[in-house]
Interface confidence: low
Amino acid sequence: KSSNEATNITPKHNMKAFLDELKAENIKKFLYNFTQIPHLAGTEQNFQLAKQIQSQWKEFGLDSVELAHYDVLLSYPNKTHPNYISIINEDGNEIFNTSLFEPPPPGYENVSDIVPPFSAFSPQGMPEGDLVYVNYARTEDFFKLERDMKINCSGKIVIARYGKVFRGNKVKNAQLAGAKGVILYSDPADYFAPGVKSYPDGWNLPGGGVQRGNILNLNGAGDPLTPGYPANEYAYRRGIAEAVGLPSIPVHPIGYYDAQKLLEKMGGSAPPDSSWRGSLKVPYNVGPGFTGNFSTQKVKMHIHSTNEVTRIYNVIGTLRGAVEPDRYVILGGHRDSWVFGGIDPQSGAAVVHEIVRSFGTLKKEGWRPRRTILFASWDAEEFGLLGSTEWAEENSRLLQERGVAYINADSSIEGNYTLRVDCTPLMYSLVHNLTKELKSPDEGFEGKSLYESWTKKSPSPEFSGMPRISKLGSGNDFEVFFQRLGIASGRARYTKNWETNKFSGYPLYHSVYETYELVEKFYDPMFKYHLTVAQVRGGMVFELANSIVLPFDCRDYAVVLRKYADKIYSISMKHPQEMKTYSVSFDSLFSAVKNFTEIASKFSERLQDFDKSNPIVLRMMNDQLMFLERAFIDPLGLPDRPFYRHVIYAPSSHNKYAGESFPGIYDALFDIESKVDPSKAWGEVKRQIYVAAFTVQAAAETLSEVA
């Protein structure tokens, strides 16, 4: 069957009908509905929302909508024994305590179940000691402290500002430095944009606002007690001592009012340079400990949170494909929030809801997609991408054989300046072509395409006249699909102007102030940016599910592979003597990339010419495109990270949010000059080049003529 036979509408009209059905007013209504009470993972409230979404997706017209539940490790504060940090004097008396909760926003004073700020999965403990300020607690910050400043963090409590890198990496770095506790805080330099008022009068973070978040280092494992397998009724669970990724030292987050009280007394070394200074009226001294008058005072943490196995619920909706029901295009985003989830995740969930409604409307008119579309409302994303990972673990055999693409749908906005897209190179052309067909919502671009405003505001650093598209990292639910299973993935949202706003994320991220009103008053009153994101995400799903030939261009992979090979080679060439001594050559990698480029080019020519009315040949060519991403998966995974199996991309070992290219080689080269056994270290570089070259060559061969 051609896709025309699957439908009573012409293909061109299909997409138009789908896009025209998406309405900003509906997204607004859904966002309001999803944000009136907290929906913390593992709570009754979030279960109720799952059942509501299940019911509404059925009403919208999906073929089936099921709840998939798992019993996973979550973490909660002790309701009767709150977490806090104090300054204690020499007698052990608490002379200052940090706040126990955020002042609730107007209109929410009587809402129950607002979980107080905490670092999820922190162990219990009451460490006390001197404070050391460690800037952002990045790898390079600890290098500066330990190697240049000769400051020892062993046995100290460190205080780090949020931003730049995933908080779990900060905690891991602090642990490796020997710290016995970590305090995380939001500095106004990173979370208070100049010229904007604090919530509720603007979108900036007030002094009492605090960012919640998990501090795990899961490296793609999912539930810490059942790595690799679903946390189902008959699961074998590890003991807590063997759990994956749990921090070993107490951690707690605070706002900048409380941080001021801790940092203003800091003594010891001055900050090494201006990049270590935030915007508080404090010296940003590194320590250790407090200055002269206060030198006998210490900091004490009081952490009483508990880790508990708790039931979570994904909602999985199916719209069966008419021609290729065994090929799955997945649109997924999470439902659980830290508190109200005004942006994260409900601005995304509301968009997914409207996309489902539009697809359902078309289905009720007699249309079906060519391929099956799966819609997912994931649970427990905030606790380590748990819902999506457990479902993918449970369904891995189906997904690796049938998964065409995964489109992520967390927060639709993190600003209102321009589009931001991270995706596999296979989707570059799809994104370009789609955004050329969509209207820009931006002021000053009336009547212009989204592609035009996006390219103007966020130009590609390499190709003029094209927009920037970034690598996929992690920190969201596409991780298991892309990094573990090798399913082509992408994500899109509206973002801020990174040039003028250098704060990290958006100021109210994971705070109680992330409300419906934040979005409706300050970010997107007309919901036009939400609508645009719905059109991009929905349009991508539509094309992936409905186009006769999959809208993947393998030539774009060839281009980036060459760029990444050049980059990693230039990093290695910072050590020319060692490369010579240990006979390190990148010839095999460059040769494989060259072969890939030639084979991809020939494949693309065949793709133009083949007989699309022959269903066997069509299916064969589409399968080669579908399985290309899969061909970059190494079943053995990356060193010490078995669930990161993509050889071309992985989350950075220093920042989970960022993507790294040729991560195996990159990590082998990282800080190689400090390795105690250079011969062994350079041997590992050579092994990683071998793995990368082999993988690229093997992937190229999947695109060759089959016989």
Partner: nanobody, 126 residues
Framework: QVQLVESGGGVVQPGRSLRLSCAAS????????MGWVRQAPGKEREFVAA????????LVSDSVKGRFTISRDNSKNTLYLQMNSLRAEDTAVYYC???????????????????WGQGTQVTVSS
């Protein structure tokens, strides 16, 4: 604040049945878990049963399992405890308790920070 008023207690012979009710009033929005706790003379309070707002999660203590059933009518803001095959050891003051929901696995635990009724006396005696 939330007010809880129990009713339905009384004196009953062993093997017979009673149905306790607990009417909730006041700001009941956000009360996600309700349950029953009993206290026999000279003994500690003992958990009997709990039910989540949806009724999807129910827990009954081993000592009353198979005999007592907990249920809830959200439209009437009322909690029930159907007690069958009563025994002398079921004699106690039965308290209704309500919580904004304790996070996670311990959702059924009630403590002093939760809402409590005044209690209703159940006496099982021949």
């Amino acid at each position: 604040q939330v007010q809880l008023v129990e009713s339905g207690g009384g004196v009953v012979q062993p093997g017979r049945s009673l149905r306790l009710s607990c009417a909730a009033s006041g700001r009941t929005f956000g009360i996600y878990v309700m349950g029953w706790v009993r206290q026999a003379p000279g003994k500690e309070r003992e958990f009997v049963a709990a039910i989540s707002w949806s009724g999807s999660d129910r827990l009954v203590s081993d000592s009353v399992k198979g005999r007592f059933t907990i249920s809830r009518d959200n439209s009437k803001n009322t909690l029930y405890l159907q007690m069958n095959s009563l025994r002398a050891e079921d004699t106690a003051v039965y308290y209704c308790a309500a919580s904004n929901r304790l996070y996670g696995r311990t959702w059924y635990d009630f403590n002093e920070s939760d809402y409590w009724g005044q209690g209703t006396q159940v006496t099982v005696s021949s």
